[in-house]
């Protein structure tokens, strides 16, 4: 998880304060007992702040110590601050927990920028606004870190929800969700609705507001509109998927689809941006620039550095194109597309110009480690991580920000041939280097 590029996003109000909620559609899939329906106790259990992550409240130890934990589908360790740090209001105090067990093993996790290190142990863990269960889980007690915790973010740890293959120090350390499923009757599935506010929130607004929902063990009807469309999980390490086509305002980028997945494509709630491989990023920006050519923006804006501001309420959303990613479907030669709006890929930034302005950063950036479908994508959709059936589902989020002219969309089916060829096979020798940092 790399800060600045990973560790996301603004979160916001449950609902679409600047936009419209879409009417429910009736073409629902058949019920799957225990997995679909209402999970009212888990709805609205996420909070967060612009660019700094969505977090859920968890308790650790006996008696329970309450901590806010960042929800990260791009890593696989449950790691919590366990020593004083200037940016932490509270931390896990192992000595106060009667159920803590020391594994007498260290863990060191370097990133491209920054790192954390700690001591491995196990303890009892629960999620107050989650399933009514307690599990014994592996915990990395972070004793030292650099550029990991974020000042004012209000979270004290990270919940890595991906697979054991990318756990540190190695794949023998069982991730939290695996422990949860093994020890309880919770189905092997979770779903995320991340709600971008569409405008920056200050600290007090964040603490009072809702950032979305993490539904553990199921799918909640109220969180999406229309139908869920599923793409296979290509390999169980990250949540890896295959993109088969990319369009900007309906115009095909016309690249070899392998480029879209070079060297992988993942769904990652711990990354703010939509991150694209170098060649794809350059082609996409060229196409977005062309689509919005009635205005010109500074070079640094397209690099995600400079902010562009408009008088409050006058952001010209209409000049910016929609972006569609076509994902491999569950049926041979069938794909579906997810479409995001500029309301997702232009990220509101707070405290920079005057209150008379709305300012934004371009939240699509270049990657050297493949496509990362971060918050920019996820804020448009309700995303179902169906681990049991090795697939990820997308539906239009009931809280996504849009306007009266356009809305995010999930549409299909489309006929796409030779989709398997779109996947990139990472040479075995490269994998160890890939794991040391996510640029």
């Amino acid at each position: 998880t790399q800060h600045g590029i990973r560790l996301p996003l603004r979160s916001g109000l449950g609902g679409a304060p600047l936009g419209l909620r879409l009417p429910r559609e009736t073409d629902e899939e058949p019920e799957e007992p225990g997995r679909r329906g209402s999970f009212v106790e888990m709805v609205d259990n996420l909070r967060g702040k612009s660019g700094q992550g969505y977090y859920v409240e968890m308790t650790v130890g006996s008696p329970p110590q309450t901590l806010n934990i960042l929800v990260d589908t791009g890593s696989s360790n449950f790691a919590v601050g366990a020593a004083p740090h200037p940016f932490l209001h509270r931390y896990y105090q192992r000595q106060l927990s009667s159920t803590y067990r020391d594994l007498r093993k260290g863990v060191y996790v370097p990133y491209t920028q920054g790192k954390w290190e700690g001591e491995l142990g196990t303890d009892l863990v629960s999620i107050p606004h989650g399933p009514n269960v307690t599990v014994r889980a592996n915990i990395a007690a972070i004793t030292e870190s650099d550029k990991f915790f974020i000042n004012g973010s209000n979270w004290e740890g990270i919940l890595g929800l991906a697979y054991a293959e990318i756990a540190r120090p190695d794949d023998s350390l069982e991730p939290f969700f695996d422990s949860l499923v093994k020890q309880t009757h919770v189905p092997n599935l979770f779903s995320l609705q991340l709600c971008g506010a569409g405008f920056p929130l200050n600290q007090s607004e964040v603490l009072a507001s809702v950032g979305g929902s993490m539904i553990i063990g199921g799918i909640d009807h109220s969180l999406y509109t229309g139908s869920l469309w599923y793409t296979p999980i290509r390999r169980e390490w990250y949540y890896e998927v295959i993109i088969v086509r990319v369009e900007i305002n309906g115009q095909d980028l016309k690249m070899d689809c392998k480029e879209y997945n070079y060297d992988k494509s993942i769904v990652d709630s711990g990354t703010t941006n939509l991150r694209l491989p170098k060649k794809v990023f350059e082609a996409a920006v060229k196409s977005i620039k062309a689509a919005s050519s009635t205005e010109k923006f500074p070079d640094g804006f397209w690099l995600g550095e400079q902010l562009v501001c408009w008088q409050a309420g006058t952001t010209p959303w209409n000049i910016f194109p929609v972006i569609s990613l076509y994902l491999m479907g569950e049926v041979t030669n069938q794909s579906f597309r997810i479409t995001i709006l500029p309301q997702q890929y232009l990220r509101p930034v707070e405290d920079v110009a005057t209150s008379q302005d709305d300012c934004y950063k371009f939240a699509i950036s270049q990657s050297s480690t493949g496509t990362v479908m971060g918050a920019v994508i996820m804020e448009g959709f309700y995303v179902v991580f169906d681990r049991a059936r090795k697939r990820i589902g997308f539906a239009v989020s009931a809280c996504h920000v849009h306007d009266e002219f356009r809305t995010a969309a999930v549409e299909g089916p489309f006929v796409t041939l030779d989709m398997e060829d779109c996947g990139y096979n990472i040479p075995q020798t490269d994998e160890s280097t890939l794991m040391t940092g996510r640029a």
């Epitope: 050519s293 009635t294 205005e295 010109k296 923006f297 500074p298 070079d299 640094g300 804006f301 550095e305 400079q306 902010l307 562009v308 501001c309 405290d351 920079v352 110009a353 300012c359």
Partner: antibody
Amino acid sequence: QLQLQESGPGLVKPSETLSLTCTVSGGSISSSSYYWGWIRQPPGKGLEWIGSIYYSGSTYYNPSLKSRVTISVDTSKNQFSLKLSSVTAADTAVYYCARVGHGISYFDLWGRGTLVTVSS
Amino acid sequence: EIVLTQSPATLSLSPGERATLSCRASQSVSSYLAWYQQKPGQAPRLLIYDASNRATGIPARFSGSGSGTDFTLTISSLEPEDFAVYYCQQAYVWPPRTFGGGTKVEIK
């Protein structure tokens, strides 16, 4: 080489509209690489950005002046213009037109400036 | 709003001396900062952009440094024509809009 020249009345009465034109010579105002801007400087004081325009007509204004400012472009004449309505003595300043270059982030070429006095 | 504060307001130096001018931003502007020189009765002239890049035709004695919130314009050895007012301007927030209050470099 490219040059900018401001023109317009040097004296404007209070409550009236100040109108200035900037003529671009030695190059095209329709270049996609630049915005064009107006900046003013009251006597003995610092610089204040008024607004900027792209050849397509897309405009950005200083929020503090927004309600009174209109900037327009005439590509056929290679000119862009400033109108500032309901002027007061506080609008007395040297008005500069400038090109916004270097990644459209900095004022890399300036006109000589024209002093506009608001007085009855 | 990002505020640029220049110091000192006035710098009294002799030709040949080194001048160090400061510009501090109220919050980070990354490296999106420029320096301008303005002589009496003339328009400003761009000296430095992106914190440290000299504009076309600017002598090597002018150099810029800094990033984030603290920036410095250095004139290694003052020439008689360098006595003027110097302004900084941020472009992190676009369109470029904010200038500092200026530093006057005068002959001692």
